[in-house]
């Protein structure tokens, strides 16, 4: 056979769906990996192929179309299941091809169990939410293209295990559901179920989302440091270990960068001769925001590193800042850092 | 200094509307969601609306829902309560409340009193 | 709705004495609860927040404690200014509801 363009086993797509439910599966090649559609590729004559390995097995197999109700079929570029099995998981290749051109891409599917509580192995996406805002609204994600739109399904939304209703901040409204002045109790995974008709039979769509409240925009700060600060004075004898808190609060801010870092005369960390080590830790409150502390410490210090400038900085996309910390050696009256 | 200063009360007969207004001053209005409480004649207080900043989000305690609406206007630095279809239980103080969900109700107006009654 | 529910309805202590006040919620509300202050004809003040933090110019007798379900608030010396009632106050989940106060009262 001719040489095939091999994409090899797309990861990006680790494509989970739940068991005895309906799933579409769209071939990978025409969103990620080719500059045409399936349209185009289809009228230029391309056939396009699908093929499996089973879980734990090498053996690439055809897919079986020809299954009791159609349970697995092709529609275009779209791989159906109607509905899945927990032994349908494995890795799915489709190849675009004719006599001249091939072209093929495999990615995972993963069939996952659930239970009545909708609890499962499934990642589910994390929607923010900001605290108190006026009206936030969720989606049902993931159910365009299993129905026509003249069906008009049942929906019915759960948080956790309990159906939403007589929720005094959140109100189903079909597809979406709606929260008003959220707050961190509204904090949790949130599952539509949408129910729909084919071919006389009734199949069932399990989406989940975790909400997650996070600080309001408006309470968006520039970093604030909390330690070092002008109170504390680090008074050292040399030989001691001289043990910096570098403490920093970082209000939330969607997709901000939050840095700190030390700076020793000038210098960081890395290009100093001072045998210092740096320890970070960061800790979030219930709204996301962000106590980034890294902890300077040098096991013996000497009477030139007592004279030395310690600077803390922080930054994030409100701004910048810094603070130096008082660093003396004991029974030396001066708190400024000495020039030679 | 954070003031709030509510208007509007009086006396009006069952089934009766009356409209509430809270003017506020020395802090940043529209950054603020608002609520009102109430506190019946020799009673406790209780929660009756809030509403969000930007004025899109808007709650009701059930004893009110449908007959109450919250509203403001950010330009003017007032807060509203439009009270429909008023009952003998809805008499009480009215009081206008600012708060965030990390402080709770930080400041509260002086109130005003609505006495509903033939 | 989340009950709060307070205890005693009225204490009666003297002038120098702690005073001790419960609240106990019927399901948890973390840290997100408040004490208020209210005296006749006035309107309330905020005390407490977040369960332990006072709010802004609340001597320091004040203080609160608890999380979850169960609440205190303590006035470690009382002074005459304290005769007052006392409401807690959850904000964890809407709607927001208040105990139905503790009356303190001179001995």
């Known amino acids: 056979s001719e040489r095939c363009d091999d994409w090899g086993l797309d990861t990006m797509r680790q494509i989970q769906v739940f068991e005895d439910e309906p799933a579409r599966i769209k071939c990978p090649l025409f969103e990620h990996f080719l500059k045409y559609n399936y349209s185009t590729a289809h009228s230029s004559g391309l056939t396009l192929i699908w093929y499996w390995t089973r879980q734990d097995r090498d053996l690439e197999e055809p897919i079986n179309f020809r299954l009791p109700e159609n349970r697995i079929s092709k529609e275009k570029d779209v791989l159906w299941f109607r509905p899945t099995l927990l032994n349908d998981t494995g890795n799915y290749t489709c190849m675009l091809r004719n006599t001249t051109y091939c072209s093929k891409v495999a990615f995972p599917l993963e069939v996952v169990q659930k239970d009545s509580c909708f609890n499962s192995a499934m990642r589910f996406p994390v929607h923010k939410m900001y605290i108190e805002h006026g009206i936030h609204k969720i989606t049902c994600p993931n159910v365009d293209g299993y129905f026509p739109s003249s069906v008009k399904p049942s929906v019915t939304w759960y948080k956790g295990c309990t159906e939403i209703v007589d929720f005094h901040n959140v109100l189903p409204e079909g597809m979406n559901l709606s929260f008003f002045i959220p707050l961190v109790s509204n904090n949790g995974n949130y599952t539509c179920v949408v129910t729909y008709p084919e071919n006389g039979r009734l199949f069932h769509l399990t989406r989940t989302v975790t909400v997650k409240v996070v600080g309001s925009p408006k309470d968006a700060l520039p970093p604030q440091i909390y330690s070092p600060n002008d109170r504390v004075v680090y008074e050292k004898e040399p030989g001691e270990e001289l043990v910096i808190p570098c403490k920093v609060y970082f209000s939330f801010i969607m997709d901000s960068h939050n840095e700190v870092w030390w700076t020793i005369d000038g210098k960081k960390p890395d290009d100093v001769t001072v045998d210092i080590t740096i320890n970070e830790s960061v800790s979030y409150s219930s709204t996301e925001d962000e106590t980034r502390t890294q902890i300077l410490s040098i096991k013996k210090v000497t009477p030139e590193d007592l004279r030395r400038n310690y600077v803390c900085h922080a930054r994030n996309t409100k701004g910048e800042a810094e603070q130096a910390a008082k660093v003396k050696q004991k029974g030396n009256g001066c708190t400024e850092p000495m020039t030679l | 200094e954070v003031q709030l200063l509510e208007s509007g009360g009086g006396l009006v007969q069952p089934g009766g509307s009356l409209r509430l207004s809270c003017a506020a001053s020395?802090?940043?209005?529209?950054?603020?969601?608002l609520g009102w409480v109430r506190q019946a004649p020799g009673k406790g207080l209780e929660w009756v609306s809030a509403?969000?900043?930007?004025?899109?989000?808007?709650l009701y305690a059930d004893s009110v829902k449908g007959r109450f609406t919250i509203s403001r206007d950010n330009s003017k630095n007032t807060l509203y309560l439009q009270m429909n279809s008023l009952r003998a239980e809805d008499t009480a103080v009215y009081y206008c409340a600012r708060f965030r969900y990390y402080t709770a109700f930080d400041y509260w107006g002086q109130g005003t009193l609505v006495t509903v009654s033939s | 709705e989340i009950v709060m529910t307070q205890s005693p309805a009225t204490l009666s202590v003297s002038p120098g004495e702690r005073a001790t006040l419960s609240c106990r919620a019927s399901q948890s509300v973390s840290s997100n609860l408040a004490w208020y202050q209210q005296k006749p004809g006035q309107a309330p003040r905020l005390l407490i927040y977040g369960a332990s933090t006072r709010a802004t110019g609340i001597p320091a007798r004040f203080s609160g404690s608890g999380s979850g379900t169960e609440f205190t608030l303590t006035i470690s010396s009382l002074q005459s200014e304290d005769f007052a009632v006392y409401y807690c106050q959850q904000y964890n989940n809407w709607p927001w509801t208040f105990g139905q106060g503790t009356k303190v009262e001179i001995k």
């Open positions: 020395g802090f940043t209005f529209p950054d603020y969601p």
């Open positions: 509403i969000s900043y930007d004025g899109e989000g808007t």
